[in-house]
C-alpha cells in the first residue's frame, strides 16, 4: 500500500559535515514496527546510506558503525547524517516502511538536497 512521506527540499550541512532533517510519514495508526531507510540518489544510481528499524516500544536503533543517527516521535523521524564531504552533496531520499502489523505500507519522500561545503584549510602559521 502507498503512503506519503515528507522531507525538506534543501538542507545545508554544517562545517563539520553534519546534516539533520525531519522525515514525516502519513500515519496509518498503530504501526508497531517501522523501518526507515536513507537513500542517496546520484544520477540514475540509488545507494543505501543507512537504515534503522524502530518499534512503538523502543527507540530508533541504527547500527553502531552507521553514518546516521536518529530519534523517533510518533510519525516523525529526526535523521542526522555525519561525516559528509563535498563529494557527498546530493539528493537524500527518506523511505519509510510500516512493517507490522499488517497491512504493509511504504512511502518515499521527494528527497532532500544536501549541500556540503568542505571547510577551507587553515593557513599555516609560523
Amino acid at each position: 500500500k502507498g503512503m506519503h512521506a515528507a522531507q525538506p527540499a534543501v538542507v545545508l550541512a554544517s562545517s563539520r559535515g553534519v546534516a539533520s532533517f525531519v522525515c514525516e510519514y502519513g500515519s496509518s495508526g498503530n504501526a508497531a514496527e517501522v523501518r526507515v531507510t536513507m537513500l542517496r540518489q546520484a544520477g540514475s544510481q540509488m545507494t543505501e546510506v543507512c537504515a534503522a528499524t524502530y518499534t512503538v516500544e523502543d527507540e530508533l536503533a541504527f547500527l553502531d558503525d552507521s553514518t546516521c543517527t536518529g530519534t523517533s516521535s510518533g510519525n516523525k523521524v529526526n535523521l542526522t547524517i555525519q561525516g559528509l564531504r563535498a563529494m557527498g552533496t546530493g539528493l537524500y531520499i527518506c523511505k519509510v516502511e510500516l512493517m507490522y502489523p499488517p497491512p504493509y505500507y511504504v512511502g518515499m519522500g521527494n528527497g532532500t538536497q544536501i549541500y556540503v561545503i568542505d571547510p577551507e584549510p587553515c593557513p599555516d602559521s609560523d
Epitope: G29, A32, E57, M99, P101
Partner: antibody, heavy 116, light 112 residues
Framework: QIQLVQSGPELKKPGETVKISCKAS????????MNWVKQAPGKGLKWMGW????????TYADDFKGRFAFSLETSASTAYLQINNLKNEDTATYFC?????????WGQGTTLTVSS | DVLMTQTPLSLPVSLGDQASISCRSS???????????LEWYLQKPGQSPKVLIY???NRFSGVPDRFSGSGSGTDFTLKISRVEAEDLGVYYC?????????FGGGTKLEIK
C-alpha cells in the same frame, strides 16, 4: 503507569447483549492496537481479534465474526467488546490487551456468565 | 490458520530443575520481512497473562535471565534454567505473524 482497567463481572441470560469496557491510561491510546482474548473456564487463551485504535478498523478471528463487535470511544481512551444474542458457550473471562510488537499490559479480565 | 502445538501439556518439576517447553507451528511463522513474532506468556492462577519473551528470543525487561527463548521457522522452545516457586503457572506460546494470530494450548508447570 500504563494500565488497562476492565468493567466488572456480568451475569446474563441467553439471547441478551453484553458490552465490556477496557479503559486505557498512561500512554497514547491511538498508538497501539487493542486486542481481545477469550478464556473459557479451565481452558486456554483464544485470540478473538483486534481493533486499530487510530482508524477504528476491526479484525475478527473466524469464530468471532457475526455476534461480536469491537468499538472505541477514543476521547475516553476506552475500547469495547459487545456480544449479541448471548449463548451458554460465551461463558468465559474476556481480556483486553494492548499490542505493539507484543502484549503488554493486559486488562484484569471481565468474567461473563451466561445462564438461564 | 496457524495451529500452535505445545508439549508437554503438563510439566512436573522440582524446584531448581531445568524446564523446557516446546511449541510447534503448523507452518512457518516467519513474517514477510524476516521477523518472527513468536512470544511466550505466563499466566499465574487468577491473574492476567504476562509477557516473558517476544520475537522468539528477546527477554522482556524485568524478566529473570533464567528464562530463554530459541527456535526458528516452525520449532520453538522456552527454557527455564532453574525453576523457582514463582515460575509456576501456565505458559502459552503465541504467533503474531499470520492473521488470525493464535495461541498454543498451554503448558502447566507444577511441582513434582
Amino acid at each position: 503507569q500504563i494500565q488497562l482497567v476492565q468493567s466488572g463481572p456480568e451475569l446474563k441470560k441467553p439471547g441478551e447483549t453484553v458490552k465490556i469496557s477496557c479503559k486505557a491510561s498512561g500512554y497514547t491510546f491511538t498508538n497501539y492496537g487493542m486486542n481481545w482474548v477469550k478464556q473459557a473456564p479451565g481452558k486456554g487463551l483464544k485470540w478473538m481479534g483486534w481493533i486499530n485504535t487510530y482508524t477504528g478498523e476491526p479484525t475478527y478471528a473466524d469464530d468471532f465474526k457475526g455476534r461480536f463487535a469491537f468499538s472505541l470511544e477514543t476521547s475516553a481512551s476506552t475500547a469495547y467488546l459487545q456480544i449479541n444474542n448471548l449463548k451458554n458457550e460465551d461463558t468465559a473471562t474476556y481480556f483486553c490487551a494492548r499490542r505493539g510488537t507484543y502484549y503488554r499490559p493486559w486488562g484484569q479480565g471481565t468474567t461473563l456468565t451466561v445462564s438461564s | 490458520d496457524v495451529l500452535m502445538t505445545q508439549t508437554p501439556l503438563s510439566l512436573p518439576v522440582s524446584l531448581g530443575d531445568q524446564a523446557s517447553i516446546s511449541c510447534r507451528s503448523s507452518q512457518s511463522i516467519v513474517y514477510s520481512h524476516g521477523n518472527t513474532y513468536l512470544e511466550w506468556y505466563l499466566q499465574k492462577p487468577g491473574q492476567s497473562p504476562k509477557v516473558l519473551i517476544y520475537k522468539v528470543s528477546n527477554r522482556f525487561s524485568g524478566v529473570p535471565d533464567r528464562f530463554s527463548g530459541s527456535g526458528s521457522g516452525t520449532d520453538f522452545t522456552l527454557k527455564i534454567s532453574r525453576v523457582e516457586a514463582e515460575d509456576l503457572g501456565v505458559y502459552y506460546c503465541f504467533q503474531g505473524s499470520h492473521v488470525p494470530w493464535t495461541f498454543g494450548g498451554g503448558t502447566k508447570l507444577e511441582i513434582k
